[in-house]
Amino acid sequence: SSPTSSASSFSSSAPFLASAVSAQPPLPDQCPALCECSEAARTVKCVNRNLTEVPTDLPAYVRNLFLTGNQLAVLPAGAFARRPPLAELAALNLSGSRLDEVRAGAFEHLPSLRQLDLSHNPLADLSPFAFSGSNASVSAPSPLVELILNHIVPPEDERQNRSFEGMVVAALLAGRALQGLRRLELASNHFLYLPRDVLAQLPSLRHLDLSNNSLVSLTYVSFRNLTHLESLHLEDNALKVLHNGTLAELQGLPHIRVFLDNNPWVCDCHMADMVTWLKETEVVQGKDRLTCAYPEKMRNRVLLELNSADLDCDPILPPSLQTS
């Protein structure tokens, strides 16, 4: 039997086969050059090989494809389109492959693709139609269930003259293709805000990770429609306080667990409602770890230990008494 049929071993192709085979239709148990394949595990790994393009001769059996640690730069339309199609491909990991551009329709013709990881790529140009595949107002539903986009923010000097948040959200919302998305990870992307319409159009979300961003406020974000949401990660942001509307929305979600660690909470009079809520809610995980960052006199005080007398605001002076 062929070496690819063993569950425990990966077969590797000799590098010299690369150019000779790439243009031909794949043989049933062929493994692309610079890759390791296991037919039994339905897995192909082309990891840390400095590949500059997606291998053309991927075996039709592939269910899990790892293309991490390469130098792909651009993912063109139909980057994974094959004849016959890669009908089994369910999990695709492209993290850390120096992608800076993902074009419209890059993931077309992957009817079973459920998990996609583009993390740790400096995506200066993410097409609005990267995931939907077309510019129709309503596209065919994407099969994606998990979309991992952690640390895809490019260096500041490589960003286009537009909002990075807006670019990512446009790709998430185009054609309403991601209505079935259950897990969305957007950690470590320097997000300053969350566009207000994004969550309303992702009604199936179970897990949302917005940790390690720069979110200052959730005032204009609505969680109300996310009735399936199970975990909301907001750790390591720049949140100062959560207001009543947000507290009520979170409290009403039937499955929710919220993570709020390491935010610079401002413990003044505006914090009173949140403290009251924290003392009674069971939805915040590790709420006893939440501490004040400001004002200076309150630094490191535990939110759960505060009472209303602690939470004061300096009186606003009338204009005539204000000094410059």
Epitope: P254, T281, V283, G286, D288
Partner: antibody
């Protein structure tokens, strides 16, 4: 599929001890609050207490009627919940149910086991 | 502790009848806009089954003839058209405050 299976019930004398177990499967055990609820023969339901999830430190809350006598614990490596019952009284005779709290525990229990009968009698 | 008073304690109705059970709390079970009041169905020798959570949300898989309403302290479970398989005891429960408490139950029988 979520499943909860209680065991350990039986006949015990007043003042005695008993340990109930609940084996959980079909969900990520550490993510959920777990509870015990009991029902005396022909009577209504009585909440015994709960144990919080990993995110909230596995701390417990008990009803006043069992405080100091009953202890709720969990072994996450075995996806198991326990109720250690000491200084048992005849009024503790009941069917004891293990139940899983919903992800947002304020919405209470969404899955229950079939129950195990504890009889306290001399 | 929050006391829950259910009424009636028992009722007998015909198949197809509209059945209403009420539950009154000794204090509000609302917290940040949601009433944390559940309804359970228990058949003889079986574990309770969740029907309604948060006063009005119907649990997945529960027939649409079951509905819940109310807020604050007064709540209602309605069976729009009683079926033979609905013979059971129904309990309300509050999870607004620890300790969680249950109503005394309403036994529903078929005439």
């Amino acid at each position: 599929e979520v499943q909860l299976v209680e065991s350990g019930g039986g006949l015990v004398q007043p003042g005695g001890s008993l340990r109930l177990s609940c084996a959980a499967s079909g969900f990520t055990f550490t993510d959920y609050y777990m509870s015990w609820v009991r029902q005396a023969p022909g009577k209504g339901l009585e909440w015994v207490g709960f144990i919080r999830n990993k995110g909230n430190g596995y701390t417990t809350e008990n009803s006043a009627s069992v405080k100091g006598r009953f202890t709720i614990s969990r072994d996450n490596s075995k996806s198991s919940l326990y109720l250690q019952m000491n200084s048992l009284k005849t009024e503790d005779t009941a069917v004891y149910y293990c139940a899983r709290y919903r992800g947002n525990p304020h919405y209470a229990m969404d899955y229950w086991g079939q129950g195990t009968l504890v009889t306290v009698s001399s | 502790d929050i006391q829950l008073t259910q009424s009636p304690s028992s009722l007998s109705a015909s198949v197809g009848d509209r059945v209403t059970i009420t539950c009154r709390a000794s204090e509000s079970v609302e917290f940040y806009g949601t009433s944390f009041l559940q309804w359970y169905q228990q058949k003889p020798g079986k574990a309770p089954k969740l029907l309604i959570y948060g006063a009005s949300n119907v649990e997945s898989g529960v027939p649409s003839r079951f509905s819940g309403s109310g807020s604050g302290t007064d709540f209602t479970l309605t069976i729009s058209s009683l079926q033979p398989e609905d013979i059971a005891t129904y309990f309300c429960q509050q999870s607004r405050k620890v300790p969680s408490t249950f109503g005394g139950g309403t036994k529903v029988e078929i005439k």
